[in-house]
Interface confidence: medium
Amino acid sequence: QNSQLQEELRGLRETFSNFTASTEAQVKGLSTQGGNVGRKMKSLESQLEKQQKDLSEDHSSLLLHVKQFVSDLRSLSCQMAALQGNGSERTCCPVNWVEHERSCYWFSRSGKAWADADNYCRLEDAHLVVVTSWEEQKFVQHHIGPVNTWMGLHDQNGPWKWVDGTDYETGFKNWRPEQPDDWYGHGLGGGEDCAHFTDDGRWNDDVCQRPYRWVCETELDKASQEPPLL
């Protein structure tokens, strides 16, 4: 009887051992699967995140394009209205010019002496930019970046003068410290009679012959309203 019990016990141990091994194998399998699922989930998550990011970027880009399209459409619509009307009023900015606070600005990408830049603007029925406020200064600075750029301010005939007649004495000024200094030490003959934006946006007087970039400005007519979109 004892030997029979021992036989049964051995059988049970064997069965239990098989069961344990089988269970362990299943657990191992499940944990591997779980790992795979986890990895798969992580991969899906990152894919989803990337798609979301791409979608968000596409959306931003599309918004920019739509904004630009609306702006172009408004500009073209205005140009057409101007061409259909008597045309003596400037109701919108010419193509390639930037509108800001009822003025149009054009930013050169090449260099000219001050007088040539002044002439260039006048040949566009405009003038070199006249800065009348800190707000306008920031706007221009944003567009020109850290590059020496002529403005419509000079003292070639004595006192400092804005090209459009804006009063210099009572107006906005943003000179660099110690400027204007009418420096003669450059060896180019004469002093410095023309004002320009420096790399930090503040103003300096320099030799008018230097080939700096420039900004043209023309004012939109006061009474004009933005035309409706077509």
Partner: antibody
């Protein structure tokens, strides 16, 4: 259709003045600059000056400064070029030309008048 | 003032030839140059603006190249109606000077 139609031929005495007209049609007159260019017999083209009818701003070549006056009449869409103290060397065909409106890029003369012959002879 | 040197002043060529006219400028004018064609007794006609752009209605055998101080007008295959005088003109500030002209004649 854009057109620039100039006045007829003129014969003038030395020392006198001539006034040539250029009537524009087919576009908004005040939206473009009008330029004047002359060509002496068998010679090349010579730029004389420009007017912006919108603002009446004018620009003249140094050579003609003080002798040439360019004006514009918005009501009739007509530009005028008057040249005074005429001499025989002023005998030429005088053209008006519209300056193409490519703001902030390059300019060009896209439409020209048919030309006006001015003969200066005693 | 800006000086314009156009060359050659005259040239003889045959129908079908490729012809090149050059315009050299005394200073950098970037792309501010136009080319015109003029036939006897007629007003000049715009061919090329901004150095490389073909004006409306101008055949594609005409092309412009260059920027800065050296510019070229090329006619790829001469047609009988192309025999005329050609002028370059700069627009880099006044005066808007023209080149001296190139007379293109039949060989």
């Amino acid at each position: 259709e854009v057109q620039l139609v100039q006045s007829g031929a003129e014969v003038k005495k030395p020392g006198s003045s001539v006034k040539v007209s250029c009537k524009a049609s087919g576009y908004t007159f005040t939206a473009y600059g009008i330029n004047w260019v002359r060509q002496a017999p068998g010679q090349g083209l010579e730029w004389m000056g420009e007017i912006f009818p919108r603002s009446d701003s004018t620009f003249y070549a140094q050579k003609f400064q003080g002798r040439v006056t360019i004006t514009a009449d918005k009501s009739t869409s007509t530009a005028y070029m008057e040249l005074s103290s005429l001499r025989s060397e002023d005998t030429a065909v005088y053209y008006c030309a519209r300056k193409g409106r490519e703001y902030g890029t390059s300019h060009y003369f896209d439409y020209w008048g048919q030309g006006t012959t001015v003969t200066v002879s005693s | 003032d800006i000086q314009m040197t156009q060359s050659p002043s005259s040239l003889s060529a045959s129908v079908g030839d490729r012809v090149t006219i050059t315009c050299r400028i005394s200073e950098n004018i970037y792309s501010n140059l136009a080319w015109y064609q003029q036939k006897p007794g007629k007003a000049p006609k715009l061919l090329i603006y901004a150095a490389i752009n073909l004006a409306e209605g101008v055949p594609s055998r005409f092309s412009g190249s260059g920027s800065g101080t050296d510019f070229t007008l090329t006619i790829s295959s001469l047609q009988p109606e192309d025999f005329a005088t050609y002028y370059c003109q700069h627009f880099w500030g006044t005066p808007f000077t023209f080149g001296q002209g190139t007379k293109l004649e039949i060989k």
